[in-house]
């Protein structure tokens, strides 16, 4: 009679994650008489997952029933299979004994786990950055099986190429991550723009994952401003608006100031949005002109998303006005009908407004 | 270890029936048939039946198809063998003896319970 | 049924001496290349003891002096060189169709 065999016939499985494995198992003689046994990898230190003779083993089931006369075949299926079930499984014949002694292994099966990564998740800066300005935006994707994955970066379908990627770790693990920082400059149309991660992996079967951050996010337009007047509306009066235009986020505050005074203070609301993103926004200012006797310097001043203000001045000739009675004091009419903001339509105005 | 524990005695009445009982240890109950093994006073060995403990699929020896009954309560690990309508003839040591090869043969025995049927 | 029919009933052996316990098959008990023969020895009081399987394998534990031996329909026993521990009466049985016993030989040690 020749000598038992144990034979696995695979060399490699390779398992979704989620689904069975099969390892499969034969012996080539009923002699010795003993139980079989599976271990997940070789030496003192390897791991048990199925022994015939004893214990509980409740995610494996064998393929032949072990009562079965002559049986031969010690094939076993494991369910629900993870990454960390990854590894070689050793089909080992023990020889009955008090105790049972180790008789032969087979070669060995390695199972591989192909595990889906997990979506990608984009973050950018902490803080806004301006157009002309670099900024970073990093990509992570977990959990996936096995190490060999793609990822690309796009900005509004174009693909960017001046990035860094690392999959973690280097040496063989039952699952990898992956990490990427991309360099993007930021310019006044990328409000509407979006940066796009894409990860494609053995398990997406050719339909990667992607992850997007939304520019509007990170970028901050700061405005232009221009401080014109108008034609006198009135005898005596003055209008003067100023044009914030093309500016993002909305957050913005305005001050008028008449010869460096603080005349009037408002927060932008109804505000109008360009194709591009961008918000114009128009303030104006009535000044009664009798009320001076020399030239005023009427400034425009902005603090826009928190920033250092910006301003915009303009210098209003008073004439030789003869003054008029009652009027002595006032700089300005505080007529609700003659101070306030208007909406200021752009050349690429999108004709509707916001109402925040 | 590998140890199969049965009732030393059992005293039956004559027409009355009996169920012996072979508590396994030691192994996995469900991965090996249980054995019933017939013996009378200074007589040889008579093979009554198998049972596979996993799904109770039977096979018993023609003659005692009608005297004895095989069991099995998986959550005890435990093999029963009841026997009917006793006899004097039933009067033996019946042993449970484990297949630990699958090869209908008996690896591991218990001591065996005697009974003795008796009015 | 295969009946086995072991020969002879009762034997005394010299120590150190050799025994010889025959079994024959009514019909052949082999199948897939293997006989299907099984060799149990029994002392008084005690449940029998696995000594041989598959007509030549000896069981774990089982001193070698024990040898088994035969094909097809007849097979033999080996005990050499016989001890006094091994006075006791010796089956042997098959499992080529549902299992049945010889009906047994007591080896008695001079």
């Known amino acids: 009679e020749e000598e038992l065999q144990v034979i696995q016939p695979d060399k490699s499985v390779s398992v979704a994650a989620g689904e069975s494995a099969i390892l499969h198992c034969t012996v080539t003689s009923l002699i010795p008489v003993g139980p079989i046994q599976w271990f997940r990898g070789a030496g003192p230190a390897r791991e048990l997952i199925y022994n015939q003779k004893e214990g509980h083993f409740p995610r494996v089931t064998t393929v032949s029933e072990s009562t079965k006369r002559e049986n031969m075949d010690f094939s076993i299926s494991i369910s629900n299979i993870t990454p960390a079930d990854a590894g070689t499984y050793y089909c080992v014949k023990f020889r009955k004994g008090s105790p049972d002694t180790e008789f032969k292994s087979g070669a060995g099966t390695e199972l591989s786990v192909r595990a889906k990564p997990s979506a990608p998740v984009v973050s950018g800066p902490a803080a806004r950055a301006t157009p002309q300005h670099t900024v970073s935006f990093t990509c992570e994707s977990h959990g996936f099986s096995p190490r060999d994955i793609t990822l690309k970066w796009f900005k509004n379908g174009n693909e960017l190429s001046d990035f860094q990627t690392n999959v973690d770790p280097v040496g063989e693990s039952v699952s990898y991550s992956i990490h990427s920082t991309a360099k993007v400059v930021l310019t006044r149309e990328d409000v509407h723009s979006q940066v796009i991660c894409e990860v494609a992996h053995v398990t997406l079967q050719g339909d990667p994952l992607r992850g997007t951050a939304n520019l509007s996010e990170t970028i901050r337009v700061p405005p232009t401003l221009e401080v014109t007047q108008q034609p006198v509306r009135a005898e005596n009066q003055v209008n003067v608006t100023c044009q914030v235009r093309k500016f993002y986020p909305q957050r913005l505050q305005l001050t008028w100031l008449e010869n460096g005074n603080v005349s009037r203070t408002e927060t932008a609301s109804t505000v109008t949005e360009n194709k591009d993103g961008t918000y114009n926004w128009m303030s104006w200012l009535l000044v009664n002109v009798s009320a001076h006797r020399d030239d005023v310097k009427l400034t425009c001043q902005v603090e826009h998303d928190g920033q250092p203000a910006v301003s915009k001045s303009h210098d209003l000739k008073v004439s030789a006005h003869p003054k008029e009675q009652g009027s002595n004091t006032a700089a300005e009419n505080t007529g609700s009908n003659e101070r306030g903001s208007s909406d200021y339509k752009d050349d690429d105005d999108k004709h509707h407004h916001h109402h925040h | 270890q590998v140890q199969l524990q049965q009732p030393g005695t059992e005293l039956v009445r004559p027409g009355a029936s009996v169920k012996l009982s072979c508590k396994a240890s030691?192994?996995?109950?469900?991965?090996?048939?249980i054995n019933w093994v017939k013996q009378r006073p200074g007589q040889g060995l008579e093979w009554i039946a198998m049972?596979?403990?996993?799904?109770?699929?039977?096979h018993y020896n023609q003659i005692f198809k009608d005297k004895a009954t095989l069991t099995v309560d998986k959550s005890s690990n435990t093999a029963y063998m009841q026997l009917s309508s006793l006899t004097s003839g039933d009067s033996a040591v019946y042993y449970c003896a484990m297949d630990y090869g699958s090869l209908y043969a008996m690896d591991y025995w218990g001591r065996g319970t005697s009974v003795t049927v008796s009015s | 049924d295969i009946v086995l029919t072991q020969s002879p009933a009762s034997l005394a052996v010299s120590l150190g001496q050799r025994a010889t316990i025959s079994c024959r098959a009514s019909k052949s008990v082999s199948s897939s290349g293997y006989n299907y023969i099984f060799w149990y020895q029994q002392k008084p009081g005690q449940p029998p003891k696995l000594l041989i399987y598959?007509?030549?394998n000896l069981d774990s534990g089982v001193p070698a002096r024990f040898s088994g031996s035969g094909s097809g329909t007849d097979f033999t026993l080996n005990i050499h060189p016989v001890e006094e521990e091994d006075a006791a009466t010796y089956y042997c049985?098959?499992?080529?169709?549902?299992?049945?016993f010889g009906g047994g030989t007591k080896l008695e040690i001079k």
């Open positions: 030691g192994y996995t109950f469900t991965n090996y048939w």
């Open positions: 049985q098959h499992s080529r169709e549902l299992p049945t």
């Open positions: 598959l007509a030549s």
């Open positions: 049972i596979d403990p996993s799904d109770s699929e039977t």
